[in-house]
Interface confidence: medium
């Protein structure tokens, strides 16, 4: 990713008065209604062949504040019989989000977008058997 | 949902104001550095007994502007023979994401954050049978 | 997935001229802003050329401009430009890249394409 500082699209904006003055509104909107906020975990990380735990990353200075990251339980998947398969593998889908963070000391408060890639929780595929050539 | 300052920080800064008035540094963005957003999408959605595809949701006037969203395959999970276990349930991972919307003809540059709630991928879950009483 | 592939650099005497040509792919190009960015050896990202989605508006960094000249074709979800009067300073690697609501910030660019003025 990459900033270029130039700007056009408010031609009497200068590129180095804009990278400093870009507001944003953070009353957060939710697209999809209240419930977003407020919808319970599920209990797939429990349920699933590919189990996983969450981990509290808590950051007083980002917003969110609280992001809860996956990690895989196993290496492997576990079977019908709660045994764990050799041949299937519990891996992390990670998904990139946007934080907002606080710059240091910043009156008024001065945020920065900032990038993550966490793990959202885990599925299970067949391991791939390298064969010698 | 709201981002309220601590009042000890900015004592002069209403929360009203605050919440019209902050300003968003862009200079620093990717806190994984570039590679982030090229990194190639992985081959999990295949070779997962939850496979998932893949559709583009895309909005210009939103940031990111294309998000993929994921959409389980199937009802069920494949088992090793590739059939399709009617015991085991493929259930969609979603996660809550921020996304920054234009206002509309701001200059300077301003934007609302959003929230999104977004497929990821999908997993393999035991069917829960519920029996009569 | 998102695409963008540049072609047409080279080597080129000062005075002479090329077009570059970027393929895109993986998103709607006529509802975007499209741009030209260059590095040049040991130097930081320039932006150099900006075009509106219908092709509309056009923006030029203050080294180019009269030279070089930015074009879209949506039909075919290509961008290009058109570079005249080449000068030893505009020796680089040229990337195009897909606008985003966020200004001057690029998520998604090719991989570049080397344009080389000398003698």
């Known amino acids: 990713a990459a900033i270029i500082p130039q700007s056009s699209a408010c031609p009497n904006t200068e590129a180095k008065d804009f990278l400093q003055n870009v507001k944003v509104n953070l009353k957060v909107f939710n697209s999809l209604g209240a419930k977003v906020s407020s919808r319970r975990p599920s209990d797939y990380l429990n349920r699933s062949t590919s189990p996983w735990t969450l981990h509290r990353n808590e950051d007083p200075d980002r917003y969110p504040s609280v992001i809860w990251e996956a990690q895989c339980r196993h290496q492997r998947c576990v079977n019908a019989e709660g045994k764990l398969d050799h041949h299937m593998n519990s891996v992390l889908i990670q998904q990139e989000i946007l934080v907002l963070k606080r710059e240091p000391e910043s009156c008024p408060f001065t945020f920065r977008v900032e990038k993550m890639l966490v793990g959202v929780g885990c599925t299970c595929v067949a391991s791939i058997v390298r064969q010698a050539a | 949902a709201a981002i309220i300052p601590q009042s000890s920080a900015c004592p002069n800064t209403e929360a009203k104001d605050f919440l019209q008035n902050v300003k968003v540094n862009l200079k620093v963005f990717n806190s994984l550095g570039a590679k982030v957003s090229s990194r190639r999408p992985s081959d999990y959605l295949n070779r997962s007994t939850s496979p998932w595809t893949l559709h583009r949701n895309e909005d210009p006037d939103r940031y990111p502007s294309v998000i993929w969203e994921a959409q389980c395959r199937h009802q069920r999970c494949v088992n090793a023979e590739g059939k399709l276990d009617h015991h085991m349930n493929s259930v969609l991972i979603q996660q809550e994401i921020l996304v920054l919307k234009r206002e509309p003809e701001s200059c300077p540059f301003t934007f609302r954050v959003e929230k999104m709630l977004v497929g990821v991928g999908c997993t393999c879950v035991a069917s829960i049978v519920r029996q009569a009483a | 997935e998102v695409q963008l592939v540049e072609s047409g650099g080279g080597l080129v005497q000062p005075g002479g001229s090329l077009r570059l040509s970027c393929a895109t792919s993986g998103f709607t190009f006529s509802s975007y802003g499209m741009y030209w960015v260059r590095q040049a050896p040991g130097k930081g990202l320039e932006w150099v050329a900006e075009?509106?989605?219908?092709?509309?508006?056009?923006y030029y960094v203050d080294s180019v401009k009269g030279r070089f000249t930015i074009s879209r074709d949506n039909a075919k979800n290509s961008l290009y430009l058109q570079m005249n009067s080449l000068r030893a300073e505009d020796t680089a690697v040229y990337y195009c890249?897909?606008?985003?609501?966020?200004?001057?910030?690029?998520?998604?660019w090719g991989q570049g394409t080397l344009v080389t003025v000398s003698s």
């Open positions: 890249a897909k606008g985003e609501i966020l200004p001057l910030y690029f998520d998604y």
């Open positions: 075009i509106k989605q219908d092709g509309s508006e056009k």
